[in-house]
């Protein structure tokens, strides 16, 4: 299933620890686009390999 995404709602402005929140409309869930140097579902881990 291909899902388009929106900006996250205000309810999830702090969802991603080091990145940008995107809301997957079809799945009805947030996702994170991590800033450089961070990994994890919520960009919670520093990428030690970066």
């Amino acid at each position: 299933v291909v899902s388009h995404f929106n900006d996250c709602p205000d309810s999830h402005t702090q969802f991603c620890f080091h990145g940008t929140c995107r809301f997957l409309v079809q799945e009805d869930k947030p996702a994170c686009v991590c800033a450089s140097g961070y990994v994890g579902a919520r960009c919670e881990h520093a990428d030690l390999l970066a």
């Epitope: 205000d10 009805d28 869930k29 579902a41 919520r42």
Partner: antibody, heavy 112, light 107 residues
Framework: VQLQQSGAELVRPGASVKLSCTAS????????MYWVKQRPEQGLEWIGR????????KYAPKFQDKATITADTSSNTAYLHLSSLTSEDTAVFYC??????WGQGTLVTVSA | DIQMTQSPSSLSASLGGKVTITCKAS??????IAWYQHKPGKGPRLFIH???KLQPGIPSRFSGSGSGRDYSFSISNLEPEDIATYYC?????????FGGGTKLEIK
């Protein structure tokens, strides 16, 4: 994905109670957990939420002094603590994850 | 916090008929509205998210629409198992809020 809530509680006015909600099939750190109240013959009321990853909470204004939400990521469990109970707190309390996944509800009866 | 005004609070309709429930938000909620069916003794069941997206397993006779502050939820070809209370939920704001609920009865 499943949310298993603790059993029914009968409590005295003025007392406190702590309800639990244990998740299986997902990690509660992946998103927020919510609690909802339904009094007999009344509608659904959103109590608040917790981000289990860091403990941050948000409460609806009317529950600010009544409810405390906590989480234990090691047991994948969220908790709702209700204080200074009155007859107005007699209700079913539901936990939820995202919008689709709900526990079966816990009935709290406040009675002398 | 955002108020959700849901109407009507109750309605009665015939089997095979169609009903529409509305929710009006006190401010723009950017289509972040969900609709639930709730039956006694059970947890609420999500039918629609993000205004019009049907949850898996929900029949297409259920539908949702709207934008800005105004949203609606419709059931066509009513069946006996549709008897329940239906709620809207806005999840745009930091503090979620439910509508007051609509109790659906069959004539």
């Amino acid at each position: 994905v499943q949310l298993q809530q603790s059993g029914a509680e009968l409590v005295r006015p003025g007392a406190s109670v702590k309800l639990s909600c244990t998740a299986s099939g997902f990690n509660i750190k992946d998103d927020y957990m919510y609690w909802v109240k339904q009094r007999p013959e009344q509608g659904l009321e959103w109590i608040g939420r917790i981000d289990p990853a860091n403990g941050n909470t948000k409460y609806a204004p009317k529950f600010q002094d009544k409810a405390t939400i906590t989480a234990d990521t090691s047991s994948n469990t969220a908790y709702l603590h209700l204080s200074s109970l009155t007859s107005e707190d007699t209700a079913v309390f539901y936990c939820a994850y995202r919008r689709a996944y709900w526990g079966q509800g816990t009935l709290v009866t406040v009675s002398a | 916090d955002i108020q959700m005004t849901q109407s009507p609070s109750s309605l009665s309709a015939s089997l095979g008929g169609k009903v529409t429930i509305t929710c009006k938000a006190s401010q723009d909620i950017n289509k972040y509205i969900a609709w639930y069916q709730h039956k006694p003794g059970k947890g609420p069941r999500l039918f629609i998210h993000y205004t019009s997206k049907l949850q898996p397993g929900i029949p297409s006779r259920f539908s949702g629409s709207g934008s800005g502050r105004d949203y609606s939820f419709s059931i066509s070809n009513l069946e006996p198992e549709d008897i329940a209370t239906y709620y809207c939920l806005q999840y745009d704001n930091l503090l979620y809020t439910f509508g007051g609920g609509t109790k659906l009865e069959i004539k």
